[in-house]
Amino acid sequence: IWELKKDVYVVELDWYPDAPGEMVVLTCDTPEEDGITWTLDQSSEVLGSGKTLTIQVKEFGDAGQYTCHKGGEVLSHSLLLLHKKEDGIWSTDILKDQKEPKNKTFLRCEAKNYSGRFTCWWLTTISTDLTFSVKSSRGSSDPQGVTCGAATLSAERVRGDNKEYEYSVECQEDSACPAAEESLPIEVMVDAVHKLKYENYTSSFFIRDIIKPDPPKNLQLKPLKNSRQVEVSWEYPDTWSTPHSYFSLTFCVQVQGKSKREKKDRVFTDKTSATVICRKNASISVRAQDRYYSSSWSEWASVPCS
């Protein structure tokens, strides 16, 4: 058993049929010694008397809010949550495995630049009685500060018969140094509580590995005289790190016909313009990637070839 917050405790249980559970001793936070009784949740049934209460915690029915009273007055509370371990592995019932980039990926994180600001998100099918708390640091042995906001519901989707809820959180490294080589990873820890079930999820990464630039902006076409060619131009996204001479992007320009089966013409360039042939009913798309480190490509910015 360990204390999550003041008056909130997590009981770690090996979860298998007929498991013996954990013996837990609760102590009433009071100088009183006599006339103390204990109840669980809304029930008025007296579970025991005295300054301490010893309980055997085996299942969710044994968890909840234990309250000690004297003469009708509440003296203190202890909320017990359960953390299940099945076959030596902590349960992951609350969040959905996103399976990308690999199995057992519950948290996914992205950064638009090297400022130390990043966003993480996760999925669940649970709609109520669900609370998250997010903490983060750079490194774990001598952690440097990262401040995370509140987890918020960012999307709802229908997946077959189920609704799926996406939560996200924004974090900012307190003393970020965009140009520095990272030697310690960012650690993100999400505590999740559904009713009386506690779980925790972690992710560890370098900002450079989760970089995904925003799409190029101001994508424009300029037809070249007496030619089927056009000059495509664009700009770095506003959210990308500056100066661009140091934080450079490379670009992929694609000409895509109306039909997905049509051959795609692709050009790679470090410049912010390119000359391509614009076919009828085609569209031109441009995406960006860090020039010197092979992290994710941005989404496409597109314009029609009309």
Epitope: L4, K5, K6, D7, V8, T39, D41, Q42, Q65, T67, V74, H77, L79, L81, S127, T128, D129, L130, T131, F132, S133, A150, A151, T152, L153, Y165, Y167, D191, V193
Partner: nanobody, 126 residues
């Protein structure tokens, strides 16, 4: 059900401080998320801040961030709103609210809260 009673309101000068209290009767107080809302005359009820069940994390409206602080004392079944550097635009009736259900996403929404106090008037004069 939790019964909530607010106290500590009054008339203060701009720049002054005030501490509001909300006392709950009901045994499951510490497993509730507790929030403060406010309503100025002729305006919608507005989220001020919340202290979340279990984790004890606090979240605030941008308009009060850095000036207001929410805390709770589970043994006394009381939640507090410490208001510093008060401004005339903070004038409103302040309500305490309690939610047993809900998710991390909707602590700012009035509809999340099941139980409400009667409110206490705070007037900030310039």
């Amino acid at each position: 059900e939790v019964q909530l009673v607010e106290s500590g309101g009054g008339l203060v000068q701009a720049g002054d401080s005030l501490r509001l209290s909300c006392t709950a009767s009901g045994r499951t107080f510490s497993s509730h998320t507790m929030a403060w809302f406010r309503q100025a005359p002729g305006k919608e009820r507005e989220f001020v801040g919340t202290i979340v069940r279990i984790f004890g994390d606090t979240y605030y409206a941008d308009s009060v961030k850095g000036r207001f602080t929410i805390s709770r004392d589970n043994a006394k079944n009381t939640v507090y709103l410490q208001m510093n550097s008060l401004k005339p635009e903070d004038t409103a009736v302040y309500y305490c609210a309690a939610a047993l259900r809900g998710t991390s996403s909707d602590w700012r929404a009035a509809a999340t809260y099941d139980d409400w106090g009667q409110g206490t008037q705070v007037t900030v004069s310039s």
